[in-house]
């Protein structure tokens, strides 16, 4: 394959593998629903190769197409809890810069307690990406029931 | 990087490409939690390339960051059977070797019938990846409900 | 970028980066459980490179292995209109050629209002998916709740 | 071909036991969960039970449950339901039936039936 | 649980005509997980369509299934005189598992 041997000793974040997965550090303090996020092989098998945290939030380094996903469970819920506490609403979004601000990802908690999508988006380096938890209830911090990452796909 | 050279005119598999989608086999004898996968091109749309089963569980052949996604349908459910029967809990991990053993993936089905998701983690040449589905209910075994997959997605 | 110049000048499509985000444009008349998708730059951050749609399905046209993936939200929903029209299910699946056809993926909104999944999957050029909603309930346009993709991820 | 005959069925009186079998042939019995139904007199077709081809995940219909277990001895290609504290309405023709590879709440192929009748 | 209500209970008919038989689910039933069965006196019952609408295993072409959501059909285009006999539906979609209560076809 020619794209095989055109791959000659270049490292690989300029092969366009830009990655991470992400842990929960906490919640934003009170009218912020934004979640904070953490990430790096001393905190367990959370990792950053390419984007960058910024104050907690996903900032991208390289254009391109990327797979956006996340799950979020919601810590202490039942199905009478979530739906009590309805509509609990997470959503994806780019929140800068401000001229590029847009959700995109967006699902309710009804009578579950975990939500968990992915999808294919374009963005750009420095786009920041935000999660937005609205409602009272608390995530879980586990760091296999609440996480958040992306994978560069194609330029 | 070695890996960039070693790349001129190598079969598919050394390119990293590893990738596997499986289906459900069947659930474990009493007091083993354990989902037993199955896959391979005579079975329909199931397939290994790289990954290997070793008794039904999935085995990573190279290192590297890899896409794990799983959908599991109960079979025997309905939205009372669900939280009736609470918590029935899908948890994926790493199970072998003990020294690596980890949950990476976890979700309850509440009030619903299917639980979906998928996350980045890192995993290594040998771990063997679990999926344990706690509680008496049966997981359905059509091929479009239920079915467990890695995708290797870079170093 | 350097990844750019060491491609020897191949367009991407030729490297296998076939990929496709697609947003809902509408549902399809009475007896026709269908979705009809639209993408494009011009509608926002839908995009279709190498796949392409007919008459509102997507069709392939590179052999591979694809992630595909889905979520579709109901538009007027509360966890008890879900259960009153319960259940309404999603199935996606290969619709043409019809000896190909098959069933890929299916989810039922039980006391939902949001189902999201995906999977890997081998698809051959001219396999046109179609996502059938059966039901009453009709799903939300909006960008950020329902979408549909897929991803080359392998020959 | 799918064979499978049920035996143990009789009279008990209310409150007693009775240990229903299923021999089965004809197919790979471990590869297939197994399911007993059940049809009082005059009645409509009721299930009753399921239990996965290794043996785990019994499930049961709430009019049984506590008072029925299903088992299975797959060296035996045998099938079982324990029936304990016997109820009047619990009179039936039992039916042990093969549950269809996919779905575990659909049976594909049925033995001719048990009568348990439950009287003093 | 679901209910399944299937009409009419006794359907006379004579040998080469069709039959059209209901089944009506008190909600949706999944996927159109239905199927029917065939049940002769004395006999267990005989796997006849799965899904709706698939014919089982060595079933004639004569019997055909349709219908999805809360009303379901078995037709019989031309009856033989082995086809009289019990017909139940049976939903598998949600657990538990139910069945109607027949719908006897006898000889006119």
């Known amino acids: 394959q020619r794209f095989a041997q055109a791959q000659q000793q270049l490292p690989l974040e300029s092969l366009g593998w830009d990655v991470a997965e992400l842990q929960l550090n906490h919640t934003g303090p009170q009218q912020d629903p934004r979640l904070y996020w953490q990430g790096g092989p001393a905190l367990g098998r959370s990792f950053l190769h390419g984007p960058e945290l910024d104050k907690g939030q996903l900032r991208i380094h390289r254009d391109g197409i990327y797979m956006v996903h996340i799950q979020v469970t919601l810590a202490i819920c039942s199905s009478t809890t979530a739906s009590r506490h309805h509509p609990t609403t997470l959503a994806v979004g780019i929140c800068s810069p401000a001229s590029r601000s847009i959700s995109l990802l967006r699902l309710s908690f009804h009578q579950g307690c975990t939500i968990a999508s992915q999808r294919l988006t374009p963005l750009a380096r420095g786009d920041t990406l935000c999660t937005n938890l609205t409602g009272t209830l608390l995530p879980s911090r586990n760091t296999d029931e609440t996480f958040f990452g992306v994978q560069w796909v194609r330029p | 990087q070695r890996f960039a050279q070693a790349q001129q005119q190598l079969p598919l598999e050394s390119l990293g490409w590893d990738v596997a989608e499986l289906q459900l086999n069947h659930t474990g004898p009493q007091q083993d939690p354990r989902l037993y996968w199955q896959g391979g091109p005579a079975l329909g749309r199931s397939f290994l390339h790289g990954p290997e089963l070793d008794k039904g569980q999935l085995r990573i052949h190279r290192d590297g960051i890899y896409m794990v996604h799983i959908q599991v349908t109960l079979a025997i459910c309905s939205s009372t059977t669900a939280s009736r029967h609470h918590p029935t809990t899908l948890a994926v991990g790493i199970c072998s070797p003990a020294s690596r053993s980890i949950s990476l993936l976890r979700l309850s089905f509440h009030q619903g019938c299917t639980i979906a998701s998928q996350r980045l983690t890192p995993l290594a040449r040998g771990d063997t990846l679990c999926t344990n589905l706690t509680g008496t209910l049966l997981p359905s075994r059509n091929t479009d409900e239920t079915f467990f997959g890695v995708q290797w997605v870079r170093p | 970028q350097r990844f750019a110049q060491a491609q020897q000048q191949l367009p991407l499509e030729s490297l296998g980066w076939d990929v496709a985000e697609l947003q809902l444009n509408h549902t399809g008349p009475q007896q026709d459980p269908r979705l009809y998708w639209q993408g494009g730059p011009a509608l926002g951050r839908s995009f279709l490179h190498g796949p392409e749609l007919d008459k509102g399905q997507l069709r392939i046209h590179r052999d591979g292995i694809y992630m595909v993936h889905i979520q579709v939200t109901l538009a007027i929903c509360s966890s008890t209109t879900a259960s009153r029209h319960h259940p309404t299910t999603l199935a996606v699946g290969i619709c043409s050629p019809a000896s190909r056809s098959i069933s890929l993926l299916r989810l039922s909104f039980h006391q939902g209002c949001t189902i999201a999944s995906q999977r890997l999957t081998p698809l051959a050029r001219g396999d046109t998916l179609c996502t059938n909603l059966t039901g009453t309930l009709l799903p939300s346009r909006n960008t950020d709740e329902t979408f549909f993709g897929v991803q080359w991820v392998r020959p | 071909e799918v064979q499978l005959l049920e035996s143990g069925g009789g009279l008990v009186q209310p409150g007693g036991s009775l240990r229903l079998s299923c021999a089965a042939s004809?197919?790979?019995?471990?590869?297939?969960?197994m399911s007993w139904v059940r049809q009082a007199p005059g009645k409509c077709l009721e299930w009753v039970s399921v239990?996965?081809?290794?043996?785990?995940?019994?499930n049961y219909a709430e009019s049984v449950k506590g008072r029925f277990t299903i088992s299975r001895d797959n060296s035996k290609n045998t099938l079982y339901l324990q029936m304990n504290s016997l109820r009047d309405e619990d009179t039936a023709v039992y039916y042990c039936?093969?549950?269809?590879?996919?779905?575990?709440?659909?049976?594909?192929?049925w033995g001719q039936g048990t009568l348990v009748t439950v009287s003093s | 649980e679901i209910v399944l209500t299937q009409s009419p209970g006794t359907l006379s008919l004579s040998p080469g005509e069709g039959a059209t038989l209901s089944c009506r689910a008190g909600?949706?039933?999944?996927?159109?997980?239905l199927g029917w069965y065939q049940q002769k006196p004395g006999q267990a019952p005989r796997l006849l369509i799965y899904g709706a609408s698939s014919r089982a295993t060595g079933i004639p072409d004569r019997f055909s299934g349709s219908g999805s959501g809360t009303d379901f059909t078995l037709t019989i285009s031309r009856l033989e005189p082995e086809d009289f006999a019990v017909y139940y539906c049976?939903?598998?979609?949600?657990?538990?598992?139910?069945f109607g209560c027949g719908t006897k076809l006898e000889i006119k």
């Open positions: 239990i996965s081809g290794s043996g785990g995940r019994p």
């Open positions: 909600q949706s039933v999944r996927s159109s997980y």
């Open positions: 004809g197919f790979t019995f471990s590869s297939y969960a």
């Open positions: 039936a093969k549950v269809d590879y996919s779905n575990y709440l659909f049976f594909d192929y």
């Open positions: 049976q939903q598998y979609g949600y657990s538990p598992p139910t």
